[in-house]
Interface confidence: medium
């Protein structure tokens, strides 16, 4: 088991060395500006964010080919959720530094959960998206 | 208030069979997935099986698959074991659990424990 | 053995705080829960911590749990004598499609 398990650590590392999950990333992004856009901020207004998506992207047009784009890379993690819930943490890790504040995060980790359903995939069971936990409360 | 009461343990002989029953009360069991737990005396916790909320999908230990079956009637609210080929190893405490797993990222817990029942497996 | 590791016994005073280890692998740990349960003796064990960090009602804040990466940490502070008792940690493993419970932890409240 421990050199099947081995083999298995190695397939899913290759798989996620060669998969480009930036378009995943752009499109949460875009969707949780989009999201935050409708309740009532300007979405001309100048962004910091390096994935800050112009006002053509902001009408769905360009989140619509990063969501293409997006799950084509997803789908070469169909046949392995162990795989996939590694590669949905990876989208996570990449993004939380740049995620302002807890809501922010909560919006965009709400999405992620989302995103293997959004492209007709099963989402991996009992994946763990929290980055660094640390002791909360449940209530 | 929740409550979980296993009967059906006992003495067996190597070779035999038995099965244990747990009574549920106080929850809406068909929205839970449900969970067998064992402890060998003075050893730690050891899971058994798991079964979801309809009964679909079921996962057991290595050394009890084939043996064990994990069963649920949730108009009578009750979890079943049914244990064949029972050995010497298979005997401990075994528990009735309640498992808190909900959706795809989210985790198993136990948070509701039955007082378990005994399971003595000798010649 | 148990896959998930933690140390078979610690010891403090009260008052003090203490940490309970427990280490696994990117298959169980790395990807998945962790809880944590509180064994006094001769009775079923409880529920102290679930989904890495949180408490069920009725359990005080003096226990909190923390994860980072592949292992996990249940913290108690303000040790009592009444938290003498075997603490066992648990995840589930992806690859062996099973929950592994850890091997255990006796503490002793001197």
């Known amino acids: 088991r421990q050199q099947w398990e081995l083999q298995g650590d190695r397939r899913c590392q290759s798989q996620l060395e060669r998969a480009n999950l930036r378009p995943c990333e752009q499109h949460l992004m875009q969707k949780i500006q989009r999201d935050e856009d409708s309740y009532g901020r300007d979405p001309y207004s100048p962004s910091q964010d390096p994935y800050s998506p112009s006002p053509y992207d902001r009408r769905g047009a360009g989140s619509s080919q990063h969501q293409e784009r997006c799950c084509n890379e997803l789908n070469e993690f169909e046949n392995n959720q162990r795989c996939m819930c590694e590669a949905l943490q990876q989208i996570m890790e990449n993004q939380s530094d740049r995620l302002q504040g807890r809501q922010q995060e909560q919006q965009f980790k709400r999405e992620l959960r989302n995103l293997p359903q959004q492209c007709g995939l099963r989402a991996p069971q009992r994946c763990d998206l929290e980055v660094e936990s640390g002791g909360r409360d449940r209530y | 208030e929740v409550q979980l009461v296993e009967s059906g343990g006992g003495l067996v002989q190597p070779g035999g069979s038995l099965r244990l029953s747990c009574a549920a009360s106080?929850?809406?069991?068909?929205?839970?997935?449900m969970t067998w737990i064992r402890q060998a005396p003075g050893k730690g916790l050891e899971w058994v099986a798991n079964?979801?909320?309809?009964?679909?999908?079921?996962d057991y230990l290595d050394s009890v698959r084939g043996r064990f079956t994990i069963s649920r009637d949730n108009a009578k609210s009750s979890l079943y074991l049914q244990m064949n080929s029972l050995r010497a190893e298979d005997t401990a405490v075994y528990y009735c659990?309640?498992?808190?797993?909900?959706?795809?990222?989210?985790?198993?817990?136990?948070?509701?424990w039955g007082q378990g029942t005994l399971v003595t497996v000798s010649s | 053995q148990s896959v998930l590791t933690q140390p078979p016994s610690i010891s403090a005073a009260p008052g003090q705080k203490v940490t309970i280890s427990c280490s696994g692998t990117?298959?169980?740990?790395?990807?998945?829960?962790v809880s944590w349960y509180q064994q006094l003796p001769r009775t079923a064990p409880r529920l102290l911590i679930f989904?890495?960090?949180k408490r069920p009602s009725g359990i005080p804040d003096r226990f909190s749990g923390s994860k980072s990466g592949s292992s996990a940490t249940l913290g108690i502070t303000g040790l009592q004598t009444g938290d003498e008792a075997h603490y066992f940690c648990?995840?589930?493993?992806?690859?062996?499609?099973?929950?592994?419970f850890g091997g255990g932890t006796k503490l002793t409240v001197l």
């Open positions: 648990a995840t589930w493993d992806a690859d062996l499609s099973a929950v592994l």
């Open positions: 989904d890495n960090t």
């Open positions: 659990t309640r498992n808190g797993l909900q959706d795809s990222y989210s985790g198993d817990f136990f948070d509701h």
């Open positions: 106080g929850f809406k069991f068909s929205t839970f997935y």
């Open positions: 079964i979801k909320q309809d009964g679909s999908e079921k």
């Open positions: 990117g298959s169980n740990i790395g990807h998945n829960y």
